[in-house]
Protein backbone atom coordinates (compact mmCIF):
# COMPACT_ATOMS: atom_id res chain seq x y z
CA UNK A 1 0.00 0.00 0.00
CA UNK A 2 2.77 2.42 1.01
CA UNK A 3 4.62 1.74 -2.25
CA UNK A 4 1.50 2.40 -4.33
CA UNK A 5 0.84 5.62 -2.43
CA UNK A 6 4.45 6.77 -2.76
CA UNK A 7 4.51 5.98 -6.46
CA UNK A 8 1.13 7.60 -7.10
CA UNK A 9 2.02 10.70 -5.13
CA UNK A 10 5.39 10.91 -6.86
CA UNK A 11 3.63 10.75 -10.22
CA UNK A 12 1.10 13.46 -9.30
CA UNK A 13 3.76 15.76 -7.80
CA UNK A 14 5.94 15.31 -10.90
CA UNK A 15 2.96 15.94 -13.17
CA UNK A 16 2.23 19.23 -11.38
CA UNK A 17 5.93 20.11 -11.50
CA UNK A 18 6.27 19.46 -15.24
CA UNK A 19 3.08 21.41 -15.94
CA UNK A 20 4.69 24.24 -13.97
CA UNK A 21 7.95 23.97 -15.94
CA UNK A 22 6.00 24.17 -19.21
CA UNK A 23 4.01 27.15 -17.87
CA UNK A 24 7.18 28.94 -16.73
CA UNK A 25 8.90 28.34 -20.07
CA UNK A 26 5.94 29.83 -21.94
CA UNK A 27 5.41 32.77 -19.58
CA UNK A 28 6.41 36.28 -20.64
CA UNK A 29 7.29 37.47 -17.14
CA UNK A 30 10.78 36.12 -16.64
CA UNK A 31 11.99 39.62 -15.98
CA UNK A 32 9.85 42.63 -15.16
CA UNK A 33 10.63 46.32 -15.08
CA UNK A 34 11.93 47.38 -11.68
CA UNK A 35 9.58 50.00 -10.26
CA UNK A 36 11.45 50.61 -7.03
CA UNK A 37 13.32 53.91 -6.78
CA UNK A 38 12.51 54.69 -10.43
CA UNK A 39 10.36 57.44 -11.92
CA UNK A 40 6.82 56.06 -12.32
CA UNK A 41 6.26 55.28 -15.97
CA UNK A 42 3.02 54.94 -17.90
CA UNK A 43 4.68 52.03 -19.68
CA UNK A 44 5.59 48.69 -18.08
CA UNK A 45 8.12 46.37 -19.68
CA UNK A 46 8.51 42.66 -19.12
CA UNK A 47 10.41 39.93 -20.93
CA UNK A 48 10.22 36.19 -21.43
CA UNK A 49 12.42 33.57 -23.07
CA UNK A 50 10.67 33.98 -26.41
CA UNK A 51 9.43 37.57 -26.58
CA UNK A 52 9.42 40.92 -24.82
CA UNK A 53 6.26 42.82 -23.98
CA UNK A 54 5.22 46.37 -23.19
CA UNK A 55 2.03 47.17 -21.32
CA UNK A 56 0.84 50.76 -21.46
CA UNK A 57 -1.39 52.49 -18.93
CA UNK A 58 -3.97 52.53 -21.70
CA UNK A 59 -4.20 48.75 -21.28
CA UNK A 60 -2.62 48.15 -24.67
CA UNK A 61 -0.04 45.36 -24.59
CA UNK A 62 2.44 44.87 -27.39
CA UNK A 63 4.65 41.80 -27.56
CA UNK A 64 7.52 41.24 -29.96
CA UNK A 65 9.15 37.87 -30.54
CA UNK A 66 12.90 37.43 -30.64
CA UNK A 67 13.06 36.66 -34.36
CA UNK A 68 16.73 35.83 -34.30
CA UNK A 69 18.84 33.01 -32.98
CA UNK A 70 22.34 34.28 -33.54
CA UNK A 71 21.65 37.74 -32.13
CA UNK A 72 20.47 36.49 -28.75
CA UNK A 73 22.73 36.31 -25.68
CA UNK A 74 24.35 32.90 -25.17
CA UNK A 75 22.97 32.77 -21.62
CA UNK A 76 19.40 33.16 -22.89
CA UNK A 77 19.98 30.36 -25.38
CA UNK A 78 21.38 28.20 -22.58
CA UNK A 79 18.32 28.87 -20.39
CA UNK A 80 16.00 28.00 -23.29
CA UNK A 81 17.93 24.77 -23.86
CA UNK A 82 17.82 23.80 -20.18
CA UNK A 83 14.08 24.43 -19.95
CA UNK A 84 13.34 22.49 -23.15
CA UNK A 85 15.52 19.57 -22.03
CA UNK A 86 13.68 19.66 -18.70
CA UNK A 87 10.29 19.56 -20.44
CA UNK A 88 11.31 16.76 -22.83
CA UNK A 89 12.79 14.61 -20.07
CA UNK A 90 9.79 15.29 -17.87
CA UNK A 91 7.34 14.39 -20.63
CA UNK A 92 9.16 11.12 -21.36
CA UNK A 93 9.33 10.46 -17.62
CA UNK A 94 5.57 10.96 -17.33
CA UNK A 95 4.94 8.59 -20.22
CA UNK A 96 7.17 5.93 -18.70
CA UNK A 97 5.75 6.39 -15.20
CA UNK A 98 2.16 5.93 -16.40
CA UNK A 99 3.02 2.39 -17.48
CA UNK A 100 5.04 1.88 -14.32
CA UNK A 101 2.18 2.73 -11.96
CA UNK A 102 1.35 -0.24 -9.76
CA UNK A 103 -2.36 0.49 -9.91
CA UNK A 104 -2.35 0.09 -13.70
CA UNK A 105 -2.23 -3.46 -15.09
CA UNK A 106 -0.76 -3.86 -18.57
CA UNK A 107 -0.87 -7.43 -19.76
CA UNK A 108 1.40 -9.66 -17.75
CA UNK A 109 4.06 -7.00 -17.06
CA UNK A 110 6.31 -8.17 -14.27
CA UNK A 111 6.84 -5.99 -11.20
CA UNK A 112 10.56 -6.08 -11.91
CA UNK A 113 9.86 -4.27 -15.20
CA UNK A 114 7.60 -1.83 -13.38
CA UNK A 115 10.34 -1.25 -10.83
CA UNK A 116 12.85 -0.48 -13.58
CA UNK A 117 10.40 1.85 -15.29
CA UNK A 118 9.64 3.58 -11.99
CA UNK A 119 13.37 4.09 -11.38
CA UNK A 120 13.87 5.34 -14.95
CA UNK A 121 11.03 7.83 -14.68
CA UNK A 122 12.22 8.91 -11.24
CA UNK A 123 15.70 9.65 -12.57
CA UNK A 124 14.17 11.50 -15.52
CA UNK A 125 12.06 13.63 -13.16
CA UNK A 126 15.09 14.41 -11.02
CA UNK A 127 17.14 15.49 -14.05
CA UNK A 128 14.14 17.41 -15.42
CA UNK A 129 13.71 19.27 -12.13
CA UNK A 130 17.42 20.02 -11.94
CA UNK A 131 17.37 21.36 -15.52
CA UNK A 132 14.48 23.70 -14.68
CA UNK A 133 16.09 24.89 -11.44
CA UNK A 134 19.41 25.41 -13.24
CA UNK A 135 17.75 27.30 -16.11
CA UNK A 136 15.83 29.60 -13.81
CA UNK A 137 18.88 30.16 -11.60
CA UNK A 138 21.10 31.03 -14.58
CA UNK A 139 18.49 33.57 -15.74
CA UNK A 140 18.17 34.99 -12.22
CA UNK A 141 21.94 35.36 -11.99
CA UNK A 142 21.95 37.14 -15.36
CA UNK A 143 19.27 39.52 -14.07
CA UNK A 144 21.15 40.30 -10.87
CA UNK A 145 24.34 41.04 -12.83
CA UNK A 146 22.52 43.28 -15.31
CA UNK A 147 20.58 44.99 -12.51
CA UNK A 148 23.71 46.14 -10.72
CA UNK A 149 25.39 47.10 -13.98
CA UNK A 150 22.43 49.27 -14.99
CA UNK A 151 22.22 50.71 -11.47
CA UNK A 152 25.85 51.78 -11.77
CA UNK A 153 25.16 53.28 -15.20
CA UNK A 154 22.18 55.23 -13.85
CA UNK A 155 24.41 57.26 -11.59
CA UNK A 156 27.16 57.94 -14.07
CA UNK A 157 27.30 60.34 -16.98
CA UNK A 158 24.65 62.65 -15.58
CA UNK A 159 26.67 65.79 -15.79
CA UNK A 160 24.40 67.33 -18.43
CA UNK A 161 20.86 68.61 -18.06
CA UNK A 162 19.29 65.69 -19.89
CA UNK A 163 19.04 62.38 -18.07
CA UNK A 164 18.49 59.00 -19.62
CA UNK A 165 16.92 56.59 -17.15
CA UNK A 166 17.94 53.06 -18.02
CA UNK A 167 15.20 50.47 -17.60
CA UNK A 168 16.21 47.98 -14.92
CA UNK A 169 14.71 44.53 -14.72
CA UNK A 170 14.00 42.40 -11.68
CA UNK A 171 12.69 38.86 -11.05
CA UNK A 172 9.44 38.06 -12.81
CA UNK A 173 6.72 35.63 -11.76
CA UNK A 174 8.03 32.95 -14.14
CA UNK A 175 11.21 32.58 -12.10
CA UNK A 176 9.27 31.69 -8.97
CA UNK A 177 6.97 29.37 -10.93
CA UNK A 178 10.07 27.73 -12.42
CA UNK A 179 11.82 27.26 -9.08
CA UNK A 180 8.74 25.79 -7.42
CA UNK A 181 7.93 23.59 -10.43
CA UNK A 182 11.52 22.36 -10.67
CA UNK A 183 11.48 21.57 -6.96
CA UNK A 184 8.21 19.67 -7.25
CA UNK A 185 9.50 17.65 -10.21
CA UNK A 186 12.65 16.85 -8.24
CA UNK A 187 10.64 15.75 -5.19
CA UNK A 188 8.36 13.68 -7.41
CA UNK A 189 11.39 12.01 -8.95
CA UNK A 190 12.85 11.18 -5.55
CA UNK A 191 9.50 9.69 -4.49
CA UNK A 192 9.45 7.53 -7.62
CA UNK A 193 12.95 6.28 -6.85
CA UNK A 194 11.91 5.44 -3.28
CA UNK A 195 8.82 3.64 -4.62
CA UNK A 196 11.05 1.68 -6.99
CA UNK A 197 12.89 0.13 -4.06
CA UNK A 198 9.61 -1.21 -2.76
CA UNK A 199 8.63 -2.58 -6.15
CA UNK A 200 11.88 -4.42 -6.90
CA UNK A 201 11.74 -8.25 -6.57
CA UNK A 202 13.71 -9.24 -3.49
CA UNK A 203 16.35 -11.39 -5.10
CA UNK A 204 18.27 -11.52 -1.85
CA UNK A 205 15.46 -13.53 -0.37
CA UNK A 206 16.03 -16.39 -2.84
CA UNK A 207 19.71 -16.48 -2.02
CA UNK A 208 18.92 -16.53 1.68
CA UNK A 209 16.62 -19.52 1.26
CA UNK A 210 19.10 -21.49 -0.82
CA UNK A 211 21.81 -20.73 1.70
CA UNK A 212 19.62 -22.05 4.49
CA UNK A 213 18.84 -25.21 2.57
CA UNK A 214 22.51 -26.03 2.02
CA UNK A 215 22.96 -26.59 5.73
CA UNK A 216 25.27 -23.67 6.52
CA UNK A 217 25.31 -22.68 10.15
CA UNK A 218 24.42 -19.11 9.35
CA UNK A 219 20.84 -18.55 8.18
CA UNK A 220 19.82 -15.21 6.66
CA UNK A 221 16.31 -14.23 7.63
CA UNK A 222 14.54 -12.48 4.79
CA UNK A 223 12.87 -10.18 7.26
CA UNK A 224 16.25 -8.66 7.95
CA UNK A 225 16.11 -6.88 4.63
CA UNK A 226 13.00 -4.95 5.56
CA UNK A 227 14.74 -1.62 5.87
CA UNK A 228 16.78 -1.90 2.74
CA UNK A 229 14.17 -3.35 0.43
CA UNK A 230 11.00 -1.68 1.59
CA UNK A 231 9.33 -5.09 1.97
CA UNK A 232 7.66 -6.39 5.07
CA UNK A 233 8.72 -9.69 6.71
CA UNK A 234 7.69 -11.87 3.83
CA UNK A 235 8.88 -15.18 5.31
CA UNK A 236 6.81 -17.19 2.87
CA UNK A 237 9.09 -15.80 0.18
CA UNK A 238 6.56 -15.98 -2.66
CA UNK A 239 7.55 -14.85 -6.11
CA UNK A 240 5.82 -11.51 -6.23
CA UNK A 241 5.08 -11.78 -9.94
CA UNK A 242 3.05 -14.99 -9.53
CA UNK A 243 -0.55 -14.54 -10.45
CA UNK A 244 -2.13 -15.35 -7.10
CA UNK A 245 0.68 -14.19 -4.87
CA UNK A 246 0.51 -10.87 -3.06
CA UNK A 247 2.99 -8.95 -0.97
CA UNK A 248 1.77 -6.95 1.98
CA UNK A 249 1.58 -3.93 -0.32
CA UNK A 250 -0.92 -5.79 -2.46
CA UNK A 251 -3.18 -7.09 0.27
CA UNK A 252 -5.67 -4.33 -0.46
CA UNK A 253 -5.54 -3.60 -4.14
CA UNK A 254 -8.81 -1.65 -4.22
CA UNK A 255 -8.37 2.11 -4.38
CA UNK A 256 -8.60 3.81 -1.02
CA UNK A 257 -9.08 7.52 -0.42
CA UNK A 258 -5.31 7.83 0.01
CA UNK A 259 -4.69 6.71 -3.56
CA UNK A 260 -5.98 10.02 -4.91
CA UNK A 261 -4.50 13.45 -4.38
Amino acid sequence: MAVTACQGLGFVVSLIGIAGIIAATCMDQWSTQDLYNNPVTAVFNYQGLWRSCVRESSGFTECRGYFTLLGLPAMLQAVRALMIVGIVLGAIGLLVSIFALKCIRIGSMEDSAKANMTLTSGIMFIVSGLCAIAGVSVFANMLVTNFWMSTANMYTGMGGMVQTVQTRYTFGAALFVGWVAGGLTLIGGVMMCIACRGLAPEETNYKAVSYHASGHSVAYKPGGFKASTGFGSNTKNKKIYDGGARTEDEVQSYPSKHDYV
Epitope: Q33, P39, V40, T41, A42, V43, N45, Y46, Q47, S52, C53, V54, E56, S57, S58, G59, F60, E62, R64, V162, Q163, T164, V165, Q166, T167
Partner: antibody, heavy 118, light 113 residues
Framework: EVQLVQSGSELKKPGASVKVSCKAS????????INWVRQAPGQGLEWMGW????????TYAEEFKGRFVFSLDTSVSTAYLQISSLKAEDTAVYFC???????????WGQGTLVTVSS | DIVMTQSPDSLAVSLGERATINCKSS????????????LTWYQQKPGQPPKLLIY???TRESGVPDRFSGSGSGTDFTLTISSLQAEDVAVYYC?????????FGGGTKVEIK
Protein backbone atom coordinates in the same frame (compact mmCIF):
# COMPACT_ATOMS: atom_id res chain seq x y z
CA GLU B 1 -18.47 57.14 -32.99
CA VAL B 2 -16.58 57.75 -29.76
CA GLN B 3 -17.98 60.74 -27.87
CA LEU B 4 -17.32 62.34 -24.50
CA VAL B 5 -19.99 64.81 -23.43
CA GLN B 6 -19.34 67.02 -20.43
CA SER B 7 -21.74 68.87 -18.15
CA GLY B 8 -22.37 72.59 -18.56
CA SER B 9 -20.55 75.62 -17.16
CA GLU B 10 -20.57 76.22 -13.42
CA LEU B 11 -20.34 79.44 -11.40
CA LYS B 12 -19.36 78.83 -7.80
CA LYS B 13 -18.35 80.78 -4.72
CA PRO B 14 -15.01 80.19 -2.99
CA GLY B 15 -15.19 77.32 -0.50
CA ALA B 16 -18.01 75.58 -2.37
CA SER B 17 -17.80 72.25 -4.24
CA VAL B 18 -18.46 71.34 -7.85
CA LYS B 19 -18.94 68.04 -9.66
CA VAL B 20 -18.18 67.89 -13.38
CA SER B 21 -19.48 64.90 -15.34
CA CYS B 22 -18.14 63.27 -18.49
CA LYS B 23 -20.49 60.85 -20.25
CA ALA B 24 -18.90 58.38 -22.67
CA SER B 25 -20.57 56.73 -25.63
CA UNK B 26 -19.60 54.77 -28.74
CA UNK B 27 -17.24 52.36 -26.99
CA UNK B 28 -17.00 50.01 -23.99
CA UNK B 29 -16.55 52.43 -21.11
CA UNK B 30 -14.57 50.10 -18.84
CA UNK B 31 -11.96 49.34 -21.51
CA UNK B 32 -10.27 52.76 -21.57
CA UNK B 33 -9.02 55.17 -18.95
CA ILE B 34 -10.44 58.66 -18.48
CA ASN B 35 -7.96 61.52 -18.02
CA TRP B 36 -8.70 64.96 -16.69
CA VAL B 37 -6.91 68.04 -18.02
CA ARG B 38 -7.15 71.60 -16.76
CA GLN B 39 -6.70 74.77 -18.80
CA ALA B 40 -6.70 78.07 -16.93
CA PRO B 41 -7.79 81.16 -18.96
CA GLY B 42 -5.11 82.00 -21.55
CA GLN B 43 -2.84 79.25 -20.21
CA GLY B 44 -1.59 75.90 -21.39
CA LEU B 45 -2.78 72.36 -20.65
CA GLU B 46 -2.20 70.75 -17.26
CA TRP B 47 -2.63 67.00 -16.77
CA MET B 48 -4.53 66.39 -13.54
CA GLY B 49 -4.59 62.60 -13.49
CA TRP B 50 -6.67 59.67 -14.63
CA UNK B 51 -9.06 56.97 -13.51
CA UNK B 52 -9.17 53.38 -14.72
CA UNK B 53 -12.86 52.50 -15.19
CA UNK B 54 -12.07 48.78 -15.14
CA UNK B 55 -10.44 48.76 -11.70
CA UNK B 56 -11.48 52.15 -10.31
CA UNK B 57 -7.80 52.89 -9.64
CA UNK B 58 -6.83 56.56 -9.74
CA THR B 59 -3.56 58.41 -10.38
CA TYR B 60 -3.25 62.11 -9.52
CA ALA B 61 -0.61 64.66 -10.43
CA GLU B 62 1.00 65.96 -7.22
CA GLU B 63 -0.65 69.39 -7.35
CA PHE B 64 -4.11 67.83 -7.71
CA LYS B 65 -3.96 65.53 -4.70
CA GLY B 66 -6.41 66.36 -1.93
CA ARG B 67 -9.24 68.60 -3.12
CA PHE B 68 -9.70 66.85 -6.45
CA VAL B 69 -11.45 63.49 -6.64
CA PHE B 70 -12.13 61.32 -9.70
CA SER B 71 -15.04 58.90 -9.57
CA LEU B 72 -17.17 56.73 -11.83
CA ASP B 73 -20.63 55.41 -12.44
CA THR B 74 -20.05 52.56 -14.86
CA SER B 75 -23.78 51.83 -15.11
CA VAL B 76 -24.23 55.10 -16.99
CA SER B 77 -20.71 55.19 -18.53
CA THR B 78 -19.88 58.42 -16.75
CA ALA B 79 -16.75 59.75 -15.08
CA TYR B 80 -16.83 62.55 -12.54
CA LEU B 81 -14.44 65.19 -11.30
CA GLN B 82 -15.27 66.67 -7.93
CA ILE B 83 -13.46 69.74 -6.63
CA SER B 84 -14.01 70.76 -3.02
CA SER B 85 -13.07 73.96 -1.16
CA LEU B 86 -12.98 75.91 -4.42
CA LYS B 87 -10.47 78.74 -4.81
CA ALA B 88 -10.29 81.57 -7.35
CA GLU B 89 -7.30 79.87 -8.97
CA ASP B 90 -9.46 76.81 -9.77
CA THR B 91 -11.20 78.92 -12.41
CA ALA B 92 -10.48 77.03 -15.62
CA VAL B 93 -11.85 74.83 -18.35
CA TYR B 94 -11.77 71.18 -17.32
CA PHE B 95 -11.50 68.56 -20.06
CA CYS B 96 -11.96 64.81 -19.89
CA UNK B 97 -10.13 62.70 -22.46
CA UNK B 98 -10.02 59.00 -23.28
CA UNK B 99 -6.70 57.21 -22.85
CA UNK B 100 -6.05 55.10 -25.93
CA UNK B 101 -3.11 52.93 -26.93
CA UNK B 102 0.15 54.76 -27.36
CA UNK B 103 -0.94 56.51 -24.13
CA UNK B 104 -2.57 59.10 -26.33
CA UNK B 105 -5.72 61.11 -25.63
CA UNK B 106 -7.65 60.31 -28.78
CA UNK B 107 -11.08 61.70 -27.82
CA TRP B 108 -11.83 64.79 -25.74
CA GLY B 109 -14.90 66.22 -24.08
CA GLN B 110 -15.95 69.72 -25.14
CA GLY B 111 -14.75 71.11 -21.80
CA THR B 112 -16.53 72.48 -18.75
CA LEU B 113 -15.84 76.02 -17.59
CA VAL B 114 -15.76 76.32 -13.82
CA THR B 115 -15.72 79.91 -12.59
CA VAL B 116 -14.97 80.59 -8.95
CA SER B 117 -15.92 84.09 -7.94
CA SER B 118 -17.32 85.80 -4.87
CA ASP C 1 8.49 65.81 -12.91
CA ILE C 2 9.48 65.69 -16.55
CA VAL C 3 9.81 69.17 -17.99
CA MET C 4 8.66 69.63 -21.59
CA THR C 5 10.15 72.71 -23.24
CA GLN C 6 8.65 73.94 -26.50
CA SER C 7 10.23 76.43 -28.85
CA PRO C 8 9.43 78.91 -30.18
CA ASP C 9 6.57 80.27 -28.09
CA SER C 10 4.96 81.65 -31.24
CA LEU C 11 5.59 81.24 -34.93
CA ALA C 12 4.41 83.29 -37.91
CA VAL C 13 4.62 81.49 -41.25
CA SER C 14 3.35 82.36 -44.70
CA LEU C 15 0.65 80.21 -46.26
CA GLY C 16 2.16 77.23 -48.07
CA GLU C 17 5.44 77.56 -46.15
CA ARG C 18 6.95 75.06 -43.73
CA ALA C 19 6.39 75.46 -39.99
CA THR C 20 8.67 73.67 -37.52
CA ILE C 21 8.00 73.36 -33.79
CA ASN C 22 10.55 71.87 -31.39
CA CYS C 23 9.99 70.04 -28.14
CA LYS C 24 12.64 68.98 -25.66
CA SER C 25 12.08 66.72 -22.66
CA SER C 26 14.19 66.64 -19.50
CA UNK C 27 14.43 62.84 -19.71
CA UNK C 28 14.42 60.39 -22.57
CA UNK C 29 10.96 59.31 -23.69
CA UNK C 30 12.31 56.30 -25.56
CA UNK C 31 11.11 53.01 -24.13
CA UNK C 32 13.75 50.31 -24.53
CA UNK C 33 11.13 47.55 -24.45
CA UNK C 34 9.53 48.41 -27.78
CA UNK C 35 11.86 51.13 -29.07
CA UNK C 36 9.01 53.63 -29.18
CA UNK C 37 9.18 57.26 -28.18
CA UNK C 38 6.24 58.16 -25.98
CA LEU C 39 5.68 61.70 -27.20
CA THR C 40 2.35 63.03 -28.42
CA TRP C 41 1.41 66.20 -30.33
CA TYR C 42 -1.94 68.02 -30.03
CA GLN C 43 -3.51 70.91 -31.87
CA GLN C 44 -5.89 73.30 -30.09
CA LYS C 45 -7.96 75.93 -31.81
CA PRO C 46 -9.61 78.76 -29.81
CA GLY C 47 -12.70 77.63 -27.91
CA GLN C 48 -12.17 73.98 -28.81
CA PRO C 49 -10.73 70.96 -27.01
CA PRO C 50 -7.29 69.77 -28.12
CA LYS C 51 -7.11 67.42 -31.10
CA LEU C 52 -4.66 64.52 -31.37
CA LEU C 53 -2.22 64.83 -34.27
CA ILE C 54 0.77 62.55 -33.68
CA TYR C 55 1.54 59.80 -31.18
CA UNK C 56 4.65 57.66 -30.61
CA UNK C 57 6.56 60.73 -31.82
CA UNK C 58 5.98 60.02 -35.50
CA THR C 59 2.74 58.07 -36.00
CA ARG C 60 0.02 60.19 -37.54
CA GLU C 61 -3.48 59.79 -36.10
CA SER C 62 -6.06 58.64 -38.65
CA GLY C 63 -7.77 61.56 -40.36
CA VAL C 64 -4.86 63.93 -39.80
CA PRO C 65 -3.59 65.50 -43.07
CA ASP C 66 -0.21 64.19 -44.21
CA ARG C 67 1.28 67.68 -44.15
CA PHE C 68 1.70 67.07 -40.42
CA SER C 69 4.67 64.94 -39.50
CA GLY C 70 6.57 64.17 -36.33
CA SER C 71 10.18 63.19 -35.85
CA GLY C 72 12.88 62.87 -33.23
CA SER C 73 13.93 60.41 -30.57
CA GLY C 74 14.98 60.34 -26.94
CA THR C 75 14.72 63.92 -25.74
CA ASP C 76 14.47 66.04 -28.91
CA PHE C 77 11.34 66.07 -31.05
CA THR C 78 9.95 68.10 -33.94
CA LEU C 79 6.49 68.70 -35.37
CA THR C 80 6.56 69.85 -38.99
CA ILE C 81 3.73 71.33 -41.02
CA SER C 82 5.08 71.00 -44.55
CA SER C 83 2.72 73.48 -46.17
CA LEU C 84 0.82 75.74 -43.79
CA GLN C 85 -2.90 76.15 -44.43
CA ALA C 86 -5.24 78.75 -42.96
CA GLU C 87 -6.99 76.06 -40.86
CA ASP C 88 -3.68 75.18 -39.19
CA VAL C 89 -3.70 78.39 -37.16
CA ALA C 90 -3.77 77.07 -33.60
CA VAL C 91 -1.70 76.37 -30.50
CA TYR C 92 0.35 73.14 -30.66
CA TYR C 93 1.29 71.16 -27.57
CA CYS C 94 3.71 68.30 -27.09
CA UNK C 95 3.09 65.85 -24.26
CA UNK C 96 5.22 63.35 -22.40
CA UNK C 97 3.25 60.09 -22.53
CA UNK C 98 5.93 58.05 -20.75
CA UNK C 99 6.41 59.31 -17.20
CA UNK C 100 3.81 60.30 -14.64
CA UNK C 101 2.68 63.03 -14.46
CA UNK C 102 1.94 63.12 -18.20
CA UNK C 103 3.16 66.69 -18.57
CA PHE C 104 2.45 69.01 -21.50
CA GLY C 105 4.78 71.52 -23.09
CA GLY C 106 3.95 75.22 -22.76
CA GLY C 107 2.51 75.37 -26.27
CA THR C 108 3.52 77.05 -29.54
CA LYS C 109 1.15 79.47 -31.20
CA VAL C 110 1.19 79.24 -35.01
CA GLU C 111 -0.06 82.25 -36.96
CA ILE C 112 -0.09 83.31 -40.59
CA LYS C 113 2.48 85.90 -41.60
Amino acid sequence: EVQLVQSGSELKKPGASVKVSCKASGYTFTNYGINWVRQAPGQGLEWMGWINPYTGETTYAEEFKGRFVFSLDTSVSTAYLQISSLKAEDTAVYFCARLYYGNRFDSWGQGTLVTVSS
Amino acid sequence: DIVMTQSPDSLAVSLGERATINCKSSQSLLNSGNQRNYLTWYQQKPGQPPKLLIYWASTRESGVPDRFSGSGSGTDFTLTISSLQAEDVAVYYCQNAYYYPLTFGGGTKVEIK
